[in-house]
C-alpha cells in the first residue's frame, strides 16, 4: 500500500454559517514541514496554498472572501511534506446564510415554561423552501432538521432546565444555502431543579472548538497553543444529511 | 471591480508557441490571484494555470506541465500564459480570471472560487 500521512484536521474559523459576500475562513492543520496545502471542494482543487517558510507553521489558513452559492458545499483538505501527500481530512459543510428571506420563529405554549412541559418551536418561511433547520446558540452543530411547506415543527418533548436558552430558525434552500436567521426566541424553563436560578445556561458565544490555532514551531514553544483536541470530536459530521 | 480584457489569439500552427496576455483594470490587481482557463467545442471550460497575487506560487493543470508558463507583471496590471510546441488539443477559447485572495501565496483553481472574468480569446491549432 502506498505510504502516506496522517490526514490533517480541517475546521471553519468563527463559524461554518457564513453570510454572503462576506470572507469565509478555513484552518487545515496538517504538519511542521508541509511544503504544501491543498483545498478540495465538492471533490474537485479549489485552492493550493504553500507556506514561506514551510517549515515553521503546523497549518495553513484558506480565506475564502465574497461567500456565495457557488462556493458552499463540502470541503477538505490535504497536505504534503516532501514528496509524500497526506490522507484527506474529514469532510466540512460549508453554509452560505442571508440568502433571499427571513422566516419568524415561534414557541408554543410560551418562551417561559416549566420543567417536564412539552415545547414545540415553529419556524415559518412564505417563500419556495422545504427544510427548516432550529439552532440554539452556542451549540450551531446541533442542528435541528423539520420539512415542511411554509412551516415546519420542531417538538421538543418534556423539557428541561438544560433547554433554556437562545434559539434561531432558518429556511434552508438546500443544504448549503441558507435564509437570514430569524429573529432569536429565549426559552426560559424553570423547574424542579434546587435553586434553579444558579442553574447553568449554554453559552451564546460561539462554539469554542470553531477557532483556529495554528502554531509556530519555535523549540520550546511548540507544544504551546496546540488546537483544542477535545473539539476534534465535534468538529466532523456536525450535520451530514 | 476588475475588468480583464484577454489578447494575443489568433491561428497559429501546430509546434508553434503563443503568448496569451490579459490586462486588467483597477488599483487592487495585486490582491488577486490570477488563472488561465479554456474551453474547447463541445467540452467543459477547464482549468489551465494560475499564479498567485504575489507571484511567488503558480499551479499548472497536469496537461498544462511542461508546455505552459504563466507569469505576472503587477507594475503593469497584466498576467501572462505562454504556451509552447502548441498541438491541435490546445484549439479553444483561453479566458482569464481573477480570485481576489486574502493571502500573497494562496493560489485558487475552481472556477466557483473566481470572482471576475474576461470575455475569452479564441487559439485555433492547424496542423
Known amino acids: 500500500p502506498k505510504q502516506t500521512l496522517p490526514k490533517p484536521i480541517i475546521r471553519a474559523e468563527s463559524t461554518y454559517m457564513v453570510p454572503k459576500e462576506k470572507q469565509a475562513t478555513l484552518c487545515c492543520q496538517g504538519s511542521y514541514g508541509a511544503v504544501e496545502y491543498q483545498l478540495h471542494f465538492e471533490g474537485s482543487l479549489f485552492a493550493v496554498e504553500r507556506p514561506k517558510p514551510p517549515e515553521r507553521i503546523n497549518g495553513v489558513k484558506f480565506h475564502i472572501p465574497d461567500m456565495n452559492s457557488r462556493k458552499a458545499g463540502r470541503y477538505s483538505c490535504i497536505y504534503r511534506v516532501g514528496e509524500l501527500w497526506s490522507e484527506r481530512s474529514d469532510l466540512l459543510d460549508l453554509v452560505v446564510t442571508e440568502m433571499y428571506d427571513t422566516p419568524t420563529l415561534s414557541v408554543h405554549p410560551g418562551p417561559e415554561v416549566t420543567s417536564g412541559e412539552k415545547v414545540t418551536f415553529y419556524c415559518r418561511l412564505d417563500t419556495a423552501t422545504s427544510m427548516f433547520l432550529l439552532l440554539k446558540e452556542g451549540r450551531s452543530r446541533d442542528v435541528q432538521r423539520s420539512y415542511g411547506k411554509v412551516q415546519a415543527e420542531f417538538p421538543m418533548g418534556p423539557v428541561t432546565t438544560a433547554h433554556r436558552g437562545s434559539y434561531r430558525c432558518f429556511g434552508s434552500y438546500n443544504n448549503y444555502a441558507w435564509s437570514f436567521p430569524s429573529e432569536p426566541v429565549k426559552l426560559l424553563v424553570t423547574g424542579d431543579i434546587e435553586n434553579t436560578s444558579l442553574a447553568p445556561t449554554d453559552p451564546t458565544f460561539p462554539d469554542s472548538w470553531d477557532t483556529c490555532l495554528l502554531t509556530r514551531e519555535t523549540g520550546l514553544q511548540k507544544d504551546l497553543a496546540l488546537w483544542d483536541h477535545t473539539a476534534q470530536n465535534h468538529h466532523h459530521h456536525h450535520h451530514h444529511h | 471591480q476588475v475588468q480583464l480584457v484577454e489578447s494575443g489569439g489568433g491561428l497559429v500552427q501546430a509546434g508553434g508557441s503563443l503568448r496569451l496576455s490579459c490586462a486588467a483594470s483597477?488599483?487592487?490587481?495585486?490582491?488577486?490571484?490570477m488563472g488561465w482557463f479554456r474551453q474547447a467545442p463541445g467540452k467543459e471550460r477547464e482549468f489551465v494555470a494560475a499564479i498567485s497575487s504575489s507571484g511567488d506560487v503558480t499551479h499548472y493543470a497536469d496537461s498544462a506541465k511542461g508546455r505552459f508558463i504563466i507569469s505576472r507583471d503587477n507594475a503593469k496590471n497584466t498576467v501572462s500564459l505562454q504556451v509552447n510546441s502548441v498541438n491541435l488539443e490546445d484549439t479553444a477559447v483561453y479566458y482569464c480570471a481573477a480570485s481576489l485572495t486574502a493571502r500573497a501565496t494562496t493560489v485558487t483553481v475552481h472556477p466557483n472560487g473566481y470572482n471576475y472574468w474576461g470575455q475569452g480569446t479564441q487559439v485555433t491549432v492547424s496542423s
Open positions: 483597477g488599483r487592487t490587481f495585486s490582491r488577486y490571484s
